[in-house]
């Protein structure tokens, strides 16, 4: 069926529209376009004869139309009047006619809107503000934005006049925001510039800071006043009711007891005409001088030097107090106080002794603290650590190694590869590594103050393929029901999967088995003798899969309660007594015997030939495992009948 599609359907004034013909019949004689929903010679726009390829304008032709051989009609420089229906009349070669009608709508391009306001400086909790979006345009939709968000739901916000007017009732300071309006029609959308609402408010009750109301003689008094206000408040200070100055801050140096009294701050807003005041009462006390600390060694060396800290000045009949890290002095053989507590000596300082240290002088009013003193303890360098801990890297990646050694002052670093100095930096970076970058990487840390140096060497292998792994253990002989064992699969490599097997089987589910560190570490908590099995780790990356040799866990256990055999307890006189003691234990236990409490021999077997009734009594076997530190025993009664 012949159809007309308008592209686009909604057309902006001045743009163009294409009336696109679908399913045009074969074997045509020609076609004509008409304005309107029917064929009307007075409203013909253009006709086209296929045989001559001749286009003939009609009465409704405006000079803006172009007809195409496929019957589509392009109308350029569209005007409002072009809105409506268009009919295509097709004459086939057999002179049978066909018609189809299409339509489009024309809309104006909207101008950029602007916002007008009925009140440029509304007062908080009093005024209302009405914003209107200009100009008024037919067939346009109006939208509003507050701080680039759509309007919040609020009973104080009201839209009217077809959403063209936004009214804010009873404005608050929180309404101070960026307001924009937007006009939309089917062919355009325009947004206004921002209008910032300037709400007048305050002053609120002023706050005086600091809150401190007690001061010592000789200190500076520096009070600051602040009240929320728009426009900003004007401030005035009164002391004991007498005006002092019109400033936000009040500064009185080197105060005395005479400066005690009531201090009032008054805040005034010239636009709202409102005043608010706040009063604080200041008390000034007479005080002794502030103490301070002197040191006999400002840069002590760790584990070598002692430091004596003295609290100054020396005042008779005064109690001296000391604090370290804001705590009272800890009990330590390395901390010594002089008889009058005025001197604190630190013997053989460590890096943890940096402080801060404070001393205090106690008087009837309070404790007067010195300023804190921090010790600059020189130490290190410790053995440097190279990170990350990977030892295997695949070719093509970047190698980025960082070295760190605890040191004061901070260490200076050097890197060597296979013994050759590379650079004097904390970090070593090599891009796009190859197998030729395999080698020994040494980080050297040097402390310029102590002159000490320490080095760490790391072997780095560059290979796409991983080596056969190995298992390291943190405990080669764990004790049953006491120790944990952590197995780690070496080496550590990037982009590598780690797997574990026990006795050739995948790991059993057990709360005592835990995988961590990306499955590289297998921890067995509270080992038992049943954990003495073969452990294997496997590693897998993009090109390799390898298993370690098995590691058998040697769990130390026992000794369990021993068993004495044979179980017989009655013997005939003249028989041989041959008792054997056995206890499950790893390693094998040491055995000893006691008869009626008297030690006999340190053997597993007790042999007595030709026993008599004199051999009646209690036979005790004692077992001892030196590795686990555990002991056990059992007692058996033997009766010999005549």
């Amino acid at each position: 069926k012949l159809t007309i599609e308008s592209t686009p359907f909604n057309v902006a004034e001045g743009k163009e529209v294409l009336l696109l013909v679908h399913n045009l019949p074969q074997h045509l004689f020609g076609y004509s376009w008409y304005k309107g929903e029917r064929v009307d010679g007075n409203r013909q726009i253009i006709g086209y004869v296929i045989g001559t390829q001749q286009a003939t304008p009609g009465p409704a032709y405006s000079g803006r139309e172009i007809i195409y051989p496929n019957a589509s009609l392009l109308i350029q420089n569209i005007i409002q009047n072009d809105t409506g229906f268009y009919t295509l009349h097709v004459i086939k070669s057999d002179l049978v006619n066909e018609e189809a009608t299409g339509q489009f709508r024309v809309y104006p391009e909207l101008p950029k809107p602007s916002i007008s306001s009925n009140n440029s400086k509304p007062v908080e909790d009093k005024d209302a503000v009405a914003f209107t979006c200009e100009p008024e345009t037919q067939d346009a939709t109006y939208l509003w934005w507050v701080n680039n968000q759509s309007l919040p739901v609020s009973p104080r916000l009201q839209l009217s006049n077809g959403n063209r007017t936004l009214t804010l009732f009873n404005v608050t300071r929180n309404d101070t925001a960026s307001y924009k309006c937007e006009t939309q029609n089917p062919v355009s959308a325009r947004r206004s510039d921002s209008v910032i609402l300037n709400v007048l408010y305050g002053p609120d009750a002023p706050t005086i800071s600091p809150l401190n109301t007690s001061y010592r003689s000789g200190e500076n008094l520096n009070l600051s006043c602040h009240a929320a206000s728009n426009p900003p408040a004007q401030y005035s200070w009164f002391v004991n009711g007498t005006f002092q100055q019109s400033t936000q801050e009040l500064f009185i140096p080197n105060i005395t007891v005479n400066n005690s009294g009531s201090y009032t701050c008054q805040a005034h807003n010239s636009d709202t005409g409102l005043n608010r005041t706040t009063v604080t009462t200041i008390t000034v006390y007479a005080e002794p001088p502030k103490p301070f600390i002197t040191s006999n060694n400002s840069n002590p060396v760790e584990d070598e030097d002692a430091v004596a800290l003295t609290c100054e000045p020396e005042i008779q009949n005064t109690t001296y107090l000391w604090w370290v890290n804001n705590q009272s002095l800890p009990v330590s053989p390395r901390l010594q106080l002089s008889n009058d507590n005025r001197t604190l000596t630190l013997l053989s300082v460590t890096r943890n002794d940096v402080g801060p240290y404070e001393c205090g002088i106690q008087n009837e009013l309070s404790v007067d603290h010195s300023d804190p003193v921090i010790l600059n303890v020189l130490y290190g360098p410790d053995d440097p650590t190279i990170s990350p801990s990977y030892t295997y890297y695949r070719p093509g990646v970047n190698l980025s190694l960082s070295c760190h050694a605890a040191s004061n002052p901070p260490a200076q670093y050097s890197w060597l590869i296979d013994g050759n100095i590379q650079q004097h930096t904390q970090e070593l970076f090599i891009s796009n590594i190859t197998e030729k970058n395999s080698g020994l990487y040494t980080c050297q840390a040097n402390n310029s103050a102590s002159g000490h140096s320490r080095t760490t060497v790391k072997t780095i292998t560059v290979s796409a393929e991983l080596p056969k792994p190995s298992i390291s253990s943190n405990n080669s002989k764990p004790v049953e029901d006491k120790d944990a064992v952590a197995f780690t699969c070496e080496p550590e490599a990037q982009n590598t999967t780690y797997l574990w097997w026990v006795n050739g089987q995948s790991l059993p589910v057990s709360p005592r088995l835990q995988l961590s560190n990306g499955n590289r570490t297998l921890t067995l908590f509270n080992v038992t003798r049943n954990d003495a099995r073969a452990y294997v780790c496997g590693i897998q990356n993009s090109v390799s899969a390898n298993r370690s040799d098995p590691v058998t866990l040697d769990v130390l256990y026992g000794p369990d309660t021993p068993i004495i055999s044979p179980p017989d307890s009655s013997y005939l006189s003249g028989a041989n007594l041959n008792l054997s003691c056995h206890s499950a234990s790893n390693p094998s236990p040491q055995y000893s015997w006691r008869i009626n409490g008297i030690p006999q021999q340190h053997t597993q077997v007790l042999f007595i030939a030709k026993i008599t009734p004199n051999n009646n009594g209690t036979y005790a076997c004692f077992v001892s495992n030196l590795a686990t530190g555990r002991n056990n025993s059992i007692v058996k009664s033997i009766t010999v009948s005549a």
Partner: antibody
């Protein structure tokens, strides 16, 4: 049972491109790296590249950069090899293969191969 | 790229005979891997990480070597061993294969 099933033989025109598939069963391709290998008629084996289907990471032999593109779809457990601008040099059998731990043993599984013939 | 040179390119052996195929690398590699391929079939991993036999490989096969020189040995040749054997290195990218050794039965 672990299996790699490759798509059927392709006859393509010179200059065109082709996309070969390799569908895995018996394991999850996200857990392993998938490799592709080329074997020209009566010739040896050439490694093309691998892909980590979990994150799309790839490593290509320099010779095949720009020629081969590896992708994977975890939902269908399938890896793909896309070959572009084909010439007679690309006439070969293409294999996918994967190295995985099957229980305690490291196993290497190969697809049956896809034959690509390029006609002028 | 690391080049792998296999020798011989082609050889025949009688049943029971000892066979050694060598693979020489242009640079040192961590391990060498060996694949077996029979006509019309996919390659099979035969020996991995220089000396480990893949699952199902007869014990008459062995692998050895280090650095740049590696070999695959069959202690006693059998008819089913006739195939093409490829060595492969995975130490550095690109991964490379040897050109192959075609082993025939006499």
């Amino acid at each position: 049972e672990v299996q790699l099933q490759q798509s059927g033989a392709e006859l393509v025109r010179s200059g065109a491109s082709v996309k070969l598939s390799c569908t895995a069963s018996g394991f999850n391709i996200k857990d392993n790296y998938m490799h592709w290998v080329k074997q020209r008629p009566e010739q040896g084996l050439e490694w093309i590249a691998w892909i980590d289907p979990e994150n799309g990471d790839t490593e290509y032999a320099p010779k095949f950069r720009g020629k081969a593109t590896l992708t994977a779809d975890s939902s269908s457990n399938t890896a793909y090899l896309h070959l572009s601008s084909l010439t007679s040099e690309d006439t070969a059998v293409y294999y996918c293969h994967v190295l995985i731990y099957a229980g305690y043993l490291a196993m290497d599984y190969w697809g049956q191969g896809t034959s690509v013939a390029v006609s002028s | 790229d690391i080049e792998l040179t296999q020798s011989p390119a082609i050889m025949s052996a009688s049943p029971g005979e000892k066979v050694t195929i060598t693979c020489s690398a242009s640079s040192s590699v961590t391990y060498m891997h060996w694949f077996q391929q029979k006509p019309g079939t996919s390659p099979k991993l035969w020996i991995y990480s220089t000396s480990n036999l893949a699952s199902g490989v007869p014990a008459r096969f062995s692998g050895s070597g280090s650095g740049t020189s590696y070999s695959l040995t069959i202690s006693r040749m059998e008819a089913e061993d006739a195939a093409t054997y490829y060595c492969q290195q995975r130490s550095t990218y690109p991964l490379t294969f040897g050109a192959g050794t075609k082993l025939e039965i006499k």
